[in-house]
């Protein structure tokens, strides 16, 4: 080994990564909100919709105070990976009715992938465990009907909206602990 030499700083550090994750989450939340509103305009929802394959909401307002960095990042990453799978499925199997929303769904998927990469980078830099999702991946079959795919889209966008909403709060809280 040669004599000690310094390394130039790389483009970001864990705190900058966390800032970047907050910004990406906020912009993804805005996109999701807008897309959900478009869905409601084009295909009015009759009540709340759910999908068994979607993750259950990780946090409530009451539990925000007790959040720990590893738990939040791990859970957020696993949940967002699930939503990414569901968005990919919607784009693939959503049928003609959802084709009009293809550009928006494509942009949403790209942003989701970018946020997941940023979270992974943050977890790597902090050296936090990054276990792959342990719950079995539920195979997503084709929707039973055109209306089935619309109901699924409502459920996916609604769930993603709630997940991103707690994610922004959680990440902002974690910034004070890093």
């Amino acid at each position: 080994p040669g004599p000690p030499a310094g390394s130039p700083r790389v483009s970001s550090d864990p705190r900058a990564d966390l800032d970047s994750a907050v910004l990406l989450t906020r912009s993804l939340l805005a996109d999701t909100r807008q897309l959900a509103a478009q869905m409601r305009d084009k295909f009015p929802a009759d009540g709340d919709h759910s999908l068994d394959s979607l993750p259950t909401l990780a946090m409530s307002a009451g539990t925000l105070g007790s959040l720990q960095l590893p738990g939040v990042l791990t859970r957020l990453r696993v949940d967002l990976m699930s939503y990414l799978r569901h968005v990919q499925w919607l784009r693939r199997a959503g049928g003609p009715s959802l084709k009009t929303l293809e550009p928006e769904l494509g942009a949403l998927q790209a942003r989701l992938e970018r946020l997941l990469r940023r979270l992974q980078l943050l977890m790597s830099r902090l050296a936090l465990p990054q276990a792959a999702p342990d719950q079995p991946v539920i195979p997503l079959g084709p929707p039973a009907s055109a209306w089935g795919s619309i109901r699924a889209a409502h459920a996916i966008l609604g769930g993603l909206h709630l997940t991103l909403d707690w994610a922004v709060r959680g990440l902002l809280l974690l910034k004070t602990r890093l």
Epitope: R9, V10, D13, P14, L121, S124, L126, A127, Q130, A132
Partner: antibody, heavy 114, light 111 residues
Framework: EVQLLESGGGLVQPGGSLRLSCAAS????????MHWVRQAPGKGLEWVSV????????YYADSVKGRFTISRDNSKNTLYLQMNSLRAEDTAVYYC???????WGQGTLVTVSS | QSVLTQPPSASGTPGQRVTISCTGS?????????VHWYQQLPGTAPKLLIY???ERPSGVPDRFSGSKSGTSASLAISGLRSEDEADYYC???????????FGGGTKLTVL
């Protein structure tokens, strides 16, 4: 400028012990996970161990599990590797690295031989 | 035997474009874990070249680029220069280890 400076390497007999240190400067040490990665003469890189930014998580390669212990002192910006029951196959340059790893030290040579 | 597979050697002439591949499995690269690339010049420590599949740290020339698809990744070097002669390693997170795994390294020769 980021600096990682390893020390503590040297010649040791099989079964012996060594403690490596890595002094960090130029970045927020307490915000980074830290790794030890080694490279045997003429060979590739082999990850050895990692410790999370706050010291709460520690993981080891199977080849060193139970023999090596990683630790850190964030107040001193220093990373450590306690190596016990050393074997000939542990002979390598040991690098301390931060983050992804993003930053690497210049390495310290550990030779295990009788 | 490395968990990530790289060709042991690659070569090219100055100005050429060379590509180095890195093949993993469904438990590392294929599971969505990002790939990072390191350059190790003779007698020196490794240096981060590409992180998160295709991002360049500041100071790394844009002649270096990375990509990832499925269980594989690749590093491309365009406008090859003599100073690019080095060993190149890919790395990805391995959830079973909770640490990174490295490829066996590729020795790049500039002819």
């Amino acid at each position: 400028e980021v600096q990682l400076l390893e020390s503590g390497g040297g010649l040791v007999q099989p079964g012996g012990s060594l403690r490596l240190s890595c002094a960090a400067s130029g970045f927020t040490f307490s915000s980074y996970g830290m790794h030890w990665v080694r490279q045997a003469p003429g060979k590739g890189l082999e990850w050895v161990s990692v410790i999370s930014y706050d010291g709460s998580y520690k993981y080891y390669a199977d080849s060193v599990k139970g023999r090596f212990t990683i630790s850190r002192d964030n107040s001193k910006n220093t990373l450590y590797l306690q190596m016990n029951s050393l074997r000939a196959e542990d002979t390598a340059v040991y690098y301390c690295a931060a983050g992804v790893p993003d930053y690497w030290g210049q390495g310290t040579l550990v030779t295990v031989s009788s | 035997q490395s968990v990530l597979t790289q060709p042991p050697s690659a070569s090219g002439t100055p100005g050429q474009r060379v590509t180095i591949s890195c093949t993993g499995s469904s438990s590392n690269i294929g599971a969505g874990y990002d790939v990072h690339w390191y350059q190790q010049l003779p007698g020196t420590a490794p240096k981060l070249l590409i992180y998160s599949n295709n991002e360049r740290p500041s100071g790394v020339p844009d002649r270096f680029s990375g990509s990832k698809s499925g269980t594989s990744a690749s590093l491309a070097i365009s406008g090859l220069r003599s100073e690019d002669e080095a060993d190149y390693y890919c790395a990805a997170w391995d959830p079973s280890l909770n640490g990174p795994v490295f490829g066996g390294g590729t020795k790049l020769t500039v002819l």
